[in-house]
Protein backbone atom coordinates (compact mmCIF):
# COMPACT_ATOMS: atom_id res chain seq x y z
CA UNK A 1 0.00 0.00 0.00
CA UNK A 2 1.37 3.40 -0.94
CA UNK A 3 0.84 5.95 1.78
CA UNK A 4 1.13 9.60 0.86
CA UNK A 5 2.20 11.41 3.99
CA UNK A 6 4.53 14.10 5.15
CA UNK A 7 5.73 14.09 8.77
CA UNK A 8 6.31 17.44 10.42
CA UNK A 9 7.43 17.47 14.03
CA UNK A 10 6.36 20.41 16.15
CA UNK A 11 6.69 20.91 19.92
CA UNK A 12 4.56 19.46 22.72
CA UNK A 13 4.12 15.92 21.44
CA UNK A 14 2.18 17.19 18.44
CA UNK A 15 2.72 16.07 14.87
CA UNK A 16 1.23 17.38 11.67
CA UNK A 17 0.39 14.67 9.16
CA UNK A 18 -0.65 15.48 5.63
CA UNK A 19 -2.63 12.96 3.62
CA UNK A 20 -4.38 12.88 0.28
CA UNK A 21 -8.09 12.61 -0.30
CA UNK A 22 -9.19 9.02 -0.93
CA UNK A 23 -5.83 7.56 0.03
CA UNK A 24 -4.66 5.80 3.20
CA UNK A 25 -2.54 7.27 5.95
CA UNK A 26 -0.77 6.28 9.15
CA UNK A 27 -1.23 8.49 12.20
CA UNK A 28 1.95 7.78 14.19
CA UNK A 29 2.12 7.12 17.90
CA UNK A 30 4.70 5.26 19.95
CA UNK A 31 5.13 4.50 23.62
CA UNK A 32 7.45 2.76 26.02
CA UNK A 33 6.69 -0.93 26.09
CA UNK A 34 4.67 -2.19 29.03
CA UNK A 35 1.94 -4.61 30.00
CA UNK A 36 -1.77 -3.91 30.26
CA UNK A 37 -1.77 -1.72 27.15
CA UNK A 38 -4.75 0.55 26.57
CA UNK A 39 -4.97 2.63 23.39
CA UNK A 40 -7.65 5.19 22.59
CA UNK A 41 -7.61 7.18 19.39
CA UNK A 42 -10.07 10.07 19.52
CA UNK A 43 -11.06 12.90 17.21
CA UNK A 44 -11.62 16.27 18.78
CA UNK A 45 -13.67 19.04 17.20
CA UNK A 46 -14.81 22.32 18.73
CA UNK A 47 -17.70 20.67 20.55
CA UNK A 48 -17.12 16.96 21.01
CA UNK A 49 -14.76 14.05 21.23
CA UNK A 50 -15.40 11.06 18.98
CA UNK A 51 -14.09 7.53 19.47
CA UNK A 52 -12.02 6.54 16.46
CA UNK A 53 -10.45 3.29 17.65
CA UNK A 54 -9.85 1.64 21.02
CA UNK A 55 -7.74 -1.27 22.16
CA UNK A 56 -7.69 -2.73 25.64
CA UNK A 57 -7.71 -6.05 27.42
CA UNK A 58 -5.85 -7.55 24.50
CA UNK A 59 -8.14 -6.71 21.61
CA UNK A 60 -9.67 -3.97 19.51
CA UNK A 61 -12.80 -2.55 21.11
CA UNK A 62 -15.09 -0.91 18.58
CA UNK A 63 -18.42 -0.90 20.44
CA UNK A 64 -18.27 2.84 20.96
CA UNK A 65 -16.53 3.69 17.66
CA UNK A 66 -18.14 6.61 15.86
CA UNK A 67 -19.89 5.40 12.70
CA UNK A 68 -17.85 7.66 10.41
CA UNK A 69 -14.77 5.53 11.19
CA UNK A 70 -16.41 2.12 10.71
CA UNK A 71 -14.23 -0.24 8.62
CA UNK A 72 -11.71 2.55 8.06
CA UNK A 73 -9.32 2.22 11.00
CA UNK A 74 -7.05 -0.41 12.45
CA UNK A 75 -4.02 -0.70 14.68
CA UNK A 76 -0.86 -2.68 14.00
CA UNK A 77 -1.88 -5.34 16.50
CA UNK A 78 1.30 -7.40 16.15
CA UNK A 79 3.41 -4.36 16.93
CA UNK A 80 1.58 -3.03 19.99
CA UNK A 81 3.81 -5.10 22.25
CA UNK A 82 6.79 -3.28 20.70
CA UNK A 83 5.40 0.15 21.55
CA UNK A 84 3.61 0.93 18.28
CA UNK A 85 0.18 2.53 18.77
CA UNK A 86 -0.03 4.03 15.27
CA UNK A 87 -3.42 4.14 13.58
CA UNK A 88 -3.90 2.96 10.01
CA UNK A 89 -6.56 5.16 8.45
CA UNK A 90 -8.24 4.21 5.17
CA UNK A 91 -9.90 6.27 2.44
CA UNK A 92 -9.34 9.79 3.76
CA UNK A 93 -12.09 12.35 3.34
CA UNK A 94 -11.89 16.09 3.87
CA UNK A 95 -14.13 15.64 6.93
CA UNK A 96 -11.31 13.65 8.55
CA UNK A 97 -9.22 16.80 8.92
CA UNK A 98 -8.62 17.85 12.49
CA UNK A 99 -7.02 16.97 15.79
CA UNK A 100 -6.56 13.34 16.83
CA UNK A 101 -5.35 12.33 20.26
CA UNK A 102 -3.79 8.98 20.98
CA UNK A 103 -4.01 7.94 24.60
CA UNK A 104 -1.76 5.05 25.62
CA UNK A 105 -1.87 3.60 29.11
CA UNK A 106 0.26 0.76 30.46
CA UNK A 107 0.92 -0.73 33.86
CA UNK A 108 3.76 1.79 34.18
CA UNK A 109 2.50 5.06 32.73
CA UNK A 110 0.00 6.92 30.60
CA UNK A 111 0.81 9.29 27.74
CA UNK A 112 -1.17 11.33 25.25
CA UNK A 113 0.09 12.15 21.78
CA UNK A 114 -1.60 14.71 19.55
CA UNK A 115 -1.70 14.40 15.77
CA UNK A 116 -3.07 17.12 13.51
CA UNK A 117 -4.34 15.60 10.28
CA UNK A 118 -4.60 17.75 7.20
CA UNK A 119 -6.08 16.39 3.99
CA UNK A 120 -5.28 17.72 0.55
CA UNK A 121 -6.23 16.90 -3.00
CA UNK A 122 -4.69 17.95 -6.29
CA UNK A 123 -6.08 16.07 -9.27
CA UNK A 124 -3.84 16.85 -12.22
CA UNK A 125 -4.80 20.19 -13.71
CA UNK A 126 -4.93 20.88 -17.43
CA UNK A 127 -4.42 23.77 -19.77
CA UNK A 128 -6.88 24.10 -22.65
CA UNK A 129 -6.84 26.30 -25.69
CA UNK A 130 -10.26 27.26 -26.96
CA UNK A 131 -11.56 29.33 -29.85
CA UNK A 132 -14.99 30.87 -29.51
CA UNK A 133 -16.05 32.67 -32.64
CA UNK A 134 -13.18 35.06 -33.31
CA UNK A 135 -11.83 34.99 -29.77
CA UNK A 136 -9.06 32.78 -28.39
CA UNK A 137 -8.89 31.68 -24.76
CA UNK A 138 -6.49 29.85 -22.52
CA UNK A 139 -8.10 27.94 -19.65
CA UNK A 140 -6.25 26.60 -16.66
CA UNK A 141 -8.48 24.04 -15.01
CA UNK A 142 -8.18 21.88 -11.90
CA UNK A 143 -11.04 19.47 -11.40
CA UNK A 144 -10.49 18.73 -7.73
CA UNK A 145 -8.23 20.66 -5.38
CA UNK A 146 -8.07 21.36 -1.64
CA UNK A 147 -7.26 23.68 -0.03
CA UNK A 148 -7.80 26.58 -2.45
CA UNK A 149 -4.76 26.82 -4.70
CA UNK A 150 -2.69 29.83 -5.71
CA UNK A 151 -3.11 30.47 -9.44
CA UNK A 152 -0.72 32.80 -11.24
CA UNK A 153 -0.46 33.81 -14.88
CA UNK A 154 2.55 35.11 -16.76
CA UNK A 155 2.78 36.63 -20.23
CA UNK A 156 6.27 36.43 -21.71
CA UNK A 157 7.53 35.65 -18.18
CA UNK A 158 5.92 38.78 -16.72
CA UNK A 159 3.18 38.25 -14.08
CA UNK A 160 -0.31 39.39 -15.11
CA UNK A 161 -3.46 39.61 -13.05
CA UNK A 162 -6.35 39.91 -15.50
CA UNK A 163 -8.09 36.55 -15.61
CA UNK A 164 -11.58 35.25 -15.07
CA UNK A 165 -11.88 32.78 -12.16
CA UNK A 166 -14.75 30.33 -11.72
CA UNK A 167 -14.99 28.11 -8.66
CA UNK A 168 -17.41 25.37 -7.62
CA UNK A 169 -17.54 23.46 -4.35
CA UNK A 170 -18.28 25.74 -1.42
CA UNK A 171 -16.43 23.77 1.26
CA UNK A 172 -14.10 21.74 -0.89
CA UNK A 173 -12.81 20.01 -2.78
CA UNK A 174 -12.93 22.85 -5.28
CA UNK A 175 -13.13 22.78 -9.04
CA UNK A 176 -11.47 25.85 -10.51
CA UNK A 177 -11.30 27.38 -13.98
CA UNK A 178 -9.08 30.37 -14.68
CA UNK A 179 -9.62 31.80 -18.14
CA UNK A 180 -7.45 34.27 -20.03
CA UNK A 181 -8.46 36.00 -23.26
CA UNK A 182 -5.44 35.85 -25.61
CA UNK A 183 -7.17 36.98 -28.80
CA UNK A 184 -4.68 38.38 -31.28
CA UNK A 185 -1.66 37.77 -29.06
CA UNK A 186 1.59 36.20 -30.18
CA UNK A 187 3.00 36.12 -26.65
CA UNK A 188 3.81 33.00 -24.68
CA UNK A 189 1.69 32.36 -21.59
CA UNK A 190 2.26 30.40 -18.43
CA UNK A 191 -0.23 29.36 -15.77
CA UNK A 192 0.94 27.98 -12.43
CA UNK A 193 -1.31 26.26 -9.92
CA UNK A 194 0.16 25.63 -6.49
CA UNK A 195 -1.22 23.50 -3.67
CA UNK A 196 0.70 24.81 -0.67
CA UNK A 197 -0.48 22.03 1.65
CA UNK A 198 0.69 19.18 -0.57
CA UNK A 199 3.69 21.24 -1.73
CA UNK A 200 2.68 20.40 -5.27
CA UNK A 201 2.93 22.73 -8.25
CA UNK A 202 1.66 22.37 -11.79
CA UNK A 203 2.59 24.63 -14.68
CA UNK A 204 0.95 25.02 -18.08
CA UNK A 205 2.83 26.82 -20.86
CA UNK A 206 1.36 27.97 -24.16
CA UNK A 207 3.40 29.07 -27.13
CA UNK A 208 2.14 30.30 -30.51
CA UNK A 209 4.61 29.55 -33.31
CA UNK A 210 4.94 31.74 -36.42
CA UNK A 211 2.39 30.96 -39.12
CA UNK A 212 3.48 28.46 -41.77
CA UNK A 213 2.56 29.11 -45.40
CA UNK A 214 2.62 26.05 -47.62
CA UNK A 215 1.50 25.11 -51.06
CA UNK A 216 -0.93 22.35 -51.85
CA UNK A 217 0.69 18.87 -52.12
CA UNK A 218 3.73 19.99 -50.13
CA UNK A 219 4.56 18.72 -46.65
CA UNK A 220 4.87 20.71 -43.48
CA UNK A 221 7.05 20.14 -40.42
CA UNK A 222 5.41 21.10 -37.13
CA UNK A 223 7.90 21.52 -34.29
CA UNK A 224 7.24 20.40 -30.72
CA UNK A 225 10.03 19.84 -28.26
CA UNK A 226 10.08 18.75 -24.69
CA UNK A 227 11.81 21.38 -22.57
CA UNK A 228 14.18 19.78 -20.07
CA UNK A 229 13.56 22.61 -17.61
CA UNK A 230 10.06 21.25 -17.18
CA UNK A 231 10.41 17.48 -17.40
CA UNK A 232 12.65 15.27 -15.32
CA UNK A 233 14.16 12.24 -17.11
CA UNK A 234 12.08 9.53 -15.38
CA UNK A 235 8.78 11.36 -15.49
CA UNK A 236 5.89 9.79 -17.38
CA UNK A 237 4.24 12.04 -19.93
CA UNK A 238 1.97 11.92 -22.94
CA UNK A 239 2.05 13.78 -26.23
CA UNK A 240 -1.11 14.57 -28.14
CA UNK A 241 -1.22 16.21 -31.54
CA UNK A 242 -4.62 17.58 -32.52
CA UNK A 243 -6.19 19.95 -34.97
CA UNK A 244 -8.51 22.81 -34.02
CA UNK A 245 -11.34 23.36 -36.44
CA UNK A 246 -14.40 25.51 -35.75
CA UNK A 247 -13.70 25.30 -32.02
CA UNK A 248 -13.58 21.50 -32.12
CA UNK A 249 -10.40 19.52 -31.53
CA UNK A 250 -9.70 16.26 -33.35
CA UNK A 251 -6.78 14.03 -32.37
CA UNK A 252 -4.16 13.23 -35.01
CA UNK A 253 -1.56 11.36 -32.97
CA UNK A 254 -1.01 10.16 -29.43
CA UNK A 255 2.18 9.03 -27.68
CA UNK A 256 2.62 7.56 -24.19
CA UNK A 257 6.12 7.64 -22.69
CA UNK A 258 5.50 4.79 -20.25
CA UNK A 259 4.77 2.30 -23.04
CA UNK A 260 6.55 4.23 -25.82
CA UNK A 261 3.54 3.49 -27.99
CA UNK A 262 2.29 5.84 -30.70
CA UNK A 263 -1.17 5.84 -32.21
CA UNK A 264 -1.74 7.77 -35.45
CA UNK A 265 -5.26 8.81 -36.39
CA UNK A 266 -4.19 10.42 -39.70
CA UNK A 267 -2.17 8.39 -42.21
CA UNK A 268 -0.36 11.47 -43.57
CA UNK A 269 1.00 12.26 -40.13
CA UNK A 270 4.40 10.93 -38.96
CA UNK A 271 7.17 11.76 -36.53
CA UNK A 272 9.83 14.03 -37.91
CA UNK A 273 12.55 11.98 -36.21
CA UNK A 274 12.82 8.65 -34.51
CA UNK A 275 11.73 9.01 -30.88
CA UNK A 276 15.01 7.76 -29.50
CA UNK A 277 15.71 10.54 -27.07
CA UNK A 278 12.03 11.17 -26.29
CA UNK A 279 12.43 14.93 -26.47
CA UNK A 280 11.58 15.98 -30.01
CA UNK A 281 7.98 15.33 -30.94
CA UNK A 282 7.92 17.34 -34.15
CA UNK A 283 5.51 16.07 -36.82
CA UNK A 284 5.36 15.87 -40.57
CA UNK A 285 2.08 16.27 -42.40
CA UNK A 286 2.41 15.25 -46.03
CA UNK A 287 0.39 15.80 -49.18
CA UNK A 288 -1.22 19.00 -47.97
CA UNK A 289 -4.64 20.00 -49.22
CA UNK A 290 -6.47 23.28 -48.84
CA UNK A 291 -8.63 21.79 -46.11
CA UNK A 292 -5.51 21.19 -43.99
CA UNK A 293 -5.34 24.91 -43.26
CA UNK A 294 -5.92 25.65 -39.58
CA UNK A 295 -4.41 25.42 -36.12
CA UNK A 296 -2.37 22.43 -34.98
CA UNK A 297 -1.87 21.83 -31.30
CA UNK A 298 0.90 19.84 -29.62
CA UNK A 299 0.17 18.98 -25.98
CA UNK A 300 2.94 17.47 -23.84
CA UNK A 301 1.57 16.67 -20.38
CA UNK A 302 2.85 15.14 -17.17
CA UNK A 303 1.58 15.29 -13.59
CA UNK A 304 3.47 18.54 -13.13
CA UNK A 305 3.44 20.25 -16.50
CA UNK A 306 1.51 20.85 -19.69
CA UNK A 307 3.28 22.39 -22.68
CA UNK A 308 0.99 23.58 -25.45
CA UNK A 309 2.47 24.58 -28.80
CA UNK A 310 0.22 26.09 -31.49
CA UNK A 311 1.04 26.12 -35.19
CA UNK A 312 -1.09 27.97 -37.71
CA UNK A 313 -0.82 26.41 -41.15
CA UNK A 314 -2.00 28.24 -44.29
CA UNK A 315 -2.23 25.97 -47.34
CA UNK A 316 -2.45 27.86 -50.61
CA UNK A 317 -3.31 26.51 -54.03
CA UNK A 318 -0.29 25.53 -56.07
CA UNK A 319 0.39 27.49 -59.31
CA UNK A 320 -0.86 24.60 -61.43
CA UNK A 321 -4.09 24.37 -59.48
CA UNK A 322 -4.54 28.12 -59.60
CA UNK A 323 -4.01 28.25 -63.38
CA UNK A 324 -6.37 25.29 -63.86
CA UNK A 325 -9.06 27.42 -62.26
Amino acid sequence: IFLSAFFTYVPMNEQIIIGRLGEDIILPSSFERGSEVVIHWKYQDSYNSYNVHSYYKGSGRLESQDTRYANRTSLFYNEIQNGNASLFFRRLSLLDEGIYTCYVGTAIQAITNKVVLKVGVFLTPMMKYEKRNTNSFLICNVLSVYPRPIITWKMDNTPISENNMQETGSLGPFSINSTLNITGSNSSYECTIENSLLKQTWTGRWTMKDGLHKMQSEHVSLSCELVNDYFSPNQDFKVTWSRMESGISSILAYYLSSSQNTTFYESRFSWNKELKNQSDFSMNLTDLSLSDSGEYLCNISSDEYTLLTIHTVHVEPSQETASDN
Epitope: V38, Y56, Y103, G105, T106
Partner: antibody
Protein backbone atom coordinates in the same frame (compact mmCIF):
# COMPACT_ATOMS: atom_id res chain seq x y z
CA UNK B 1 2.91 10.09 45.65
CA UNK B 2 -0.61 9.29 44.46
CA UNK B 3 -3.30 10.61 46.81
CA UNK B 4 -7.07 10.37 46.63
CA UNK B 5 -9.11 12.11 49.31
CA UNK B 6 -12.88 11.61 49.51
CA UNK B 7 -15.27 14.05 51.17
CA UNK B 8 -18.97 14.84 51.40
CA UNK B 9 -20.17 11.80 53.32
CA UNK B 10 -22.68 12.02 56.15
CA UNK B 11 -26.14 11.05 57.33
CA UNK B 12 -28.99 11.59 54.90
CA UNK B 13 -32.66 10.62 54.83
CA UNK B 14 -33.99 8.12 52.30
CA UNK B 15 -35.05 9.78 49.05
CA UNK B 16 -32.68 12.73 49.57
CA UNK B 17 -29.49 13.58 47.69
CA UNK B 18 -25.83 13.82 48.54
CA UNK B 19 -22.75 14.78 46.56
CA UNK B 20 -19.40 13.12 47.17
CA UNK B 21 -16.08 14.57 46.02
CA UNK B 22 -12.65 13.13 45.49
CA UNK B 23 -9.56 15.34 45.29
CA UNK B 24 -6.63 13.83 43.42
CA UNK B 25 -2.92 14.67 43.56
CA UNK B 26 0.47 13.14 42.81
CA UNK B 27 -0.34 12.07 39.25
CA UNK B 28 -1.65 13.48 35.97
CA UNK B 29 -5.34 13.33 36.76
CA UNK B 30 -6.48 13.75 33.14
CA UNK B 31 -4.59 10.59 32.13
CA UNK B 32 -6.54 8.19 34.34
CA UNK B 33 -10.01 6.79 34.73
CA UNK B 34 -11.50 7.00 38.22
CA UNK B 35 -13.98 4.62 39.85
CA UNK B 36 -16.25 4.73 42.84
CA UNK B 37 -16.35 1.52 44.89
CA UNK B 38 -18.42 1.08 48.03
CA UNK B 39 -18.45 -1.24 51.01
CA UNK B 40 -21.47 -1.65 53.23
CA UNK B 41 -20.62 -2.04 56.94
CA UNK B 42 -19.21 -5.53 57.57
CA UNK B 43 -19.78 -6.53 53.93
CA UNK B 44 -17.74 -7.00 50.76
CA UNK B 45 -16.75 -4.56 48.03
CA UNK B 46 -19.15 -3.38 45.32
CA UNK B 47 -18.13 -1.45 42.20
CA UNK B 48 -20.39 1.60 41.65
CA UNK B 49 -19.25 3.63 38.62
CA UNK B 50 -16.34 4.66 36.43
CA UNK B 51 -15.56 7.75 34.39
CA UNK B 52 -12.88 7.63 31.72
CA UNK B 53 -9.82 9.89 31.66
CA UNK B 54 -11.44 12.49 29.38
CA UNK B 55 -14.97 12.16 30.72
CA UNK B 56 -16.17 10.67 27.44
CA UNK B 57 -17.37 7.35 28.82
CA UNK B 58 -19.28 6.64 32.03
CA UNK B 59 -20.53 3.28 33.27
CA UNK B 60 -22.65 2.37 36.27
CA UNK B 61 -23.59 -0.67 38.30
CA UNK B 62 -27.21 -1.75 37.76
CA UNK B 63 -27.99 -0.97 41.40
CA UNK B 64 -27.29 2.77 40.99
CA UNK B 65 -27.95 3.45 37.30
CA UNK B 66 -30.38 6.35 36.85
CA UNK B 67 -29.88 7.58 40.42
CA UNK B 68 -26.13 8.28 40.59
CA UNK B 69 -24.10 10.49 38.25
CA UNK B 70 -20.32 10.45 38.04
CA UNK B 71 -18.46 13.50 36.77
CA UNK B 72 -14.98 15.00 36.77
CA UNK B 73 -13.26 18.34 36.39
CA UNK B 74 -9.80 17.76 34.94
CA UNK B 75 -8.84 21.39 35.41
CA UNK B 76 -9.36 21.04 39.17
CA UNK B 77 -8.30 17.39 39.58
CA UNK B 78 -11.62 16.52 41.17
CA UNK B 79 -14.12 13.71 40.83
CA UNK B 80 -17.75 13.85 41.95
CA UNK B 81 -20.56 11.42 42.59
CA UNK B 82 -24.03 12.93 42.66
CA UNK B 83 -26.31 10.53 44.54
CA UNK B 84 -30.06 11.08 44.23
CA UNK B 85 -33.05 9.11 45.54
CA UNK B 86 -30.90 7.51 48.21
CA UNK B 87 -31.97 4.24 49.80
CA UNK B 88 -31.01 2.46 53.03
CA UNK B 89 -29.05 -0.09 50.98
CA UNK B 90 -26.79 2.71 49.72
CA UNK B 91 -25.32 2.99 53.22
CA UNK B 92 -21.59 2.28 52.82
CA UNK B 93 -18.08 3.62 52.88
CA UNK B 94 -17.50 5.11 49.42
CA UNK B 95 -13.99 4.88 48.02
CA UNK B 96 -12.68 6.63 44.95
CA UNK B 97 -10.11 4.45 43.22
CA UNK B 98 -7.80 5.15 40.28
CA UNK B 99 -7.92 2.83 37.30
CA UNK B 100 -4.67 1.39 36.01
CA UNK B 101 -5.04 3.64 32.96
CA UNK B 102 -7.86 5.32 31.04
CA UNK B 103 -10.73 3.70 32.86
CA UNK B 104 -10.99 0.91 30.32
CA UNK B 105 -9.00 -1.64 32.30
CA UNK B 106 -11.32 -1.78 35.27
CA UNK B 107 -9.14 -2.61 38.22
CA UNK B 108 -7.93 -0.33 40.95
CA UNK B 109 -4.28 0.54 41.47
CA UNK B 110 -4.81 3.27 44.08
CA UNK B 111 -7.57 3.90 46.62
CA UNK B 112 -8.67 6.78 48.81
CA UNK B 113 -9.36 6.35 52.53
CA UNK B 114 -13.13 6.38 51.99
CA UNK B 115 -16.06 8.50 53.19
CA UNK B 116 -19.04 7.06 55.07
CA UNK B 117 -22.56 7.63 53.76
CA UNK B 118 -25.41 6.65 56.08
CA UNK B 119 -28.95 6.64 54.71
CA UNK B 120 -31.36 6.57 57.61
CA UNK B 121 -34.61 8.16 58.65
CA UNK C 1 -23.50 -9.89 35.68
CA UNK C 2 -20.58 -12.27 36.18
CA UNK C 3 -20.69 -13.84 39.66
CA UNK C 4 -17.44 -14.37 41.56
CA UNK C 5 -17.30 -17.04 44.26
CA UNK C 6 -14.40 -17.26 46.70
CA UNK C 7 -13.46 -20.15 48.90
CA UNK C 8 -12.98 -20.59 51.72
CA UNK C 9 -14.83 -17.71 53.35
CA UNK C 10 -12.55 -17.92 56.36
CA UNK C 11 -9.09 -19.42 56.61
CA UNK C 12 -6.92 -19.96 59.66
CA UNK C 13 -3.21 -20.70 59.15
CA UNK C 14 0.11 -20.50 60.95
CA UNK C 15 3.05 -18.26 60.22
CA UNK C 16 5.21 -19.92 57.54
CA UNK C 17 2.32 -21.92 56.07
CA UNK C 18 1.57 -22.02 52.35
CA UNK C 19 -1.92 -20.57 51.89
CA UNK C 20 -4.17 -20.89 48.84
CA UNK C 21 -7.41 -18.99 48.16
CA UNK C 22 -9.63 -19.95 45.23
CA UNK C 23 -11.88 -17.76 43.10
CA UNK C 24 -14.37 -19.07 40.56
CA UNK C 25 -16.13 -17.00 37.85
CA UNK C 26 -19.62 -17.86 36.63
CA UNK C 27 -18.33 -17.54 33.04
CA UNK C 28 -14.94 -17.23 31.38
CA UNK C 29 -13.12 -14.00 32.12
CA UNK C 30 -9.88 -14.93 30.34
CA UNK C 31 -7.13 -13.58 32.63
CA UNK C 32 -8.90 -10.36 33.60
CA UNK C 33 -8.77 -10.92 37.33
CA UNK C 34 -7.29 -8.88 40.19
CA UNK C 35 -6.63 -9.74 43.84
CA UNK C 36 -6.82 -7.20 46.69
CA UNK C 37 -5.83 -7.24 50.33
CA UNK C 38 -7.87 -5.25 52.86
CA UNK C 39 -6.73 -4.83 56.42
CA UNK C 40 -9.28 -3.85 59.10
CA UNK C 41 -10.30 -0.20 58.88
CA UNK C 42 -8.19 0.42 55.75
CA UNK C 43 -8.77 0.76 52.05
CA UNK C 44 -8.07 -2.26 49.84
CA UNK C 45 -4.63 -2.67 48.25
CA UNK C 46 -3.92 -4.17 44.82
CA UNK C 47 -1.78 -7.32 44.96
CA UNK C 48 -2.18 -9.09 41.61
CA UNK C 49 -3.58 -8.04 38.22
CA UNK C 50 -4.18 -9.99 35.03
CA UNK C 51 -4.47 -13.15 37.14
CA UNK C 52 -0.74 -13.56 37.70
CA UNK C 53 1.08 -10.19 37.41
CA UNK C 54 2.49 -8.98 40.72
CA UNK C 55 1.85 -5.32 41.44
CA UNK C 56 4.95 -3.22 42.04
CA UNK C 57 5.97 -3.14 45.71
CA UNK C 58 4.04 -6.29 46.66
CA UNK C 59 6.14 -9.00 48.37
CA UNK C 60 7.09 -11.90 46.12
CA UNK C 61 5.50 -14.43 48.51
CA UNK C 62 2.19 -13.48 46.86
CA UNK C 63 1.43 -15.11 43.50
CA UNK C 64 -1.60 -15.65 41.31
CA UNK C 65 -2.54 -18.22 38.71
CA UNK C 66 -5.42 -19.45 36.59
CA UNK C 67 -7.43 -18.39 33.57
CA UNK C 68 -10.94 -18.80 32.25
CA UNK C 69 -13.08 -19.52 35.32
CA UNK C 70 -10.68 -20.92 37.96
CA UNK C 71 -8.13 -18.73 39.77
CA UNK C 72 -5.96 -19.00 42.86
CA UNK C 73 -4.04 -16.63 45.09
CA UNK C 74 -1.11 -18.24 46.90
CA UNK C 75 0.92 -16.95 49.83
CA UNK C 76 4.04 -19.10 49.84
CA UNK C 77 5.05 -18.41 53.44
CA UNK C 78 2.45 -16.71 55.64
CA UNK C 79 3.62 -13.69 57.63
CA UNK C 80 1.88 -11.99 60.59
CA UNK C 81 1.42 -8.88 58.43
CA UNK C 82 -0.78 -10.90 56.05
CA UNK C 83 -3.73 -10.87 58.46
CA UNK C 84 -6.46 -9.39 56.24
CA UNK C 85 -9.46 -10.07 54.05
CA UNK C 86 -8.66 -10.96 50.42
CA UNK C 87 -10.94 -10.17 47.48
CA UNK C 88 -10.85 -11.28 43.87
CA UNK C 89 -12.38 -9.01 41.21
CA UNK C 90 -13.18 -9.63 37.56
CA UNK C 91 -12.67 -6.80 35.10
CA UNK C 92 -13.54 -8.67 31.94
CA UNK C 93 -16.73 -6.69 31.42
CA UNK C 94 -19.01 -4.11 33.03
CA UNK C 95 -20.27 -4.43 35.69
CA UNK C 96 -17.06 -5.21 37.54
CA UNK C 97 -17.73 -7.67 40.34
CA UNK C 98 -15.91 -8.82 43.46
CA UNK C 99 -15.87 -12.12 45.27
CA UNK C 100 -17.43 -12.07 48.74
CA UNK C 101 -13.99 -12.12 50.37
CA UNK C 102 -11.80 -14.58 52.26
CA UNK C 103 -10.88 -13.65 55.83
CA UNK C 104 -7.40 -14.89 56.71
CA UNK C 105 -6.64 -15.40 60.39
CA UNK C 106 -3.34 -16.26 61.98
CA UNK C 107 -3.38 -19.29 64.33
Amino acid sequence: QVQLVESGGGVVQPGRSLRLSCAASGFTFSDYGIHWVRQAPGKGLEWVAVIWYDGSDKYYADSVRGRFTISRDNSKNTLSLQMNSLRAEDTAVYYCARDRSSGAMGYFAYWGQGTLVTVSS
Amino acid sequence: DIQMTQSPSTLSASVGDRVTITCRASQSISSWLAWYQQKPGKAPKLLIYKASSLESGVPSRFSGSGSGTEFTLTISSLQPDDLATYYCQQYNSYSYTFGQGTKLEIK
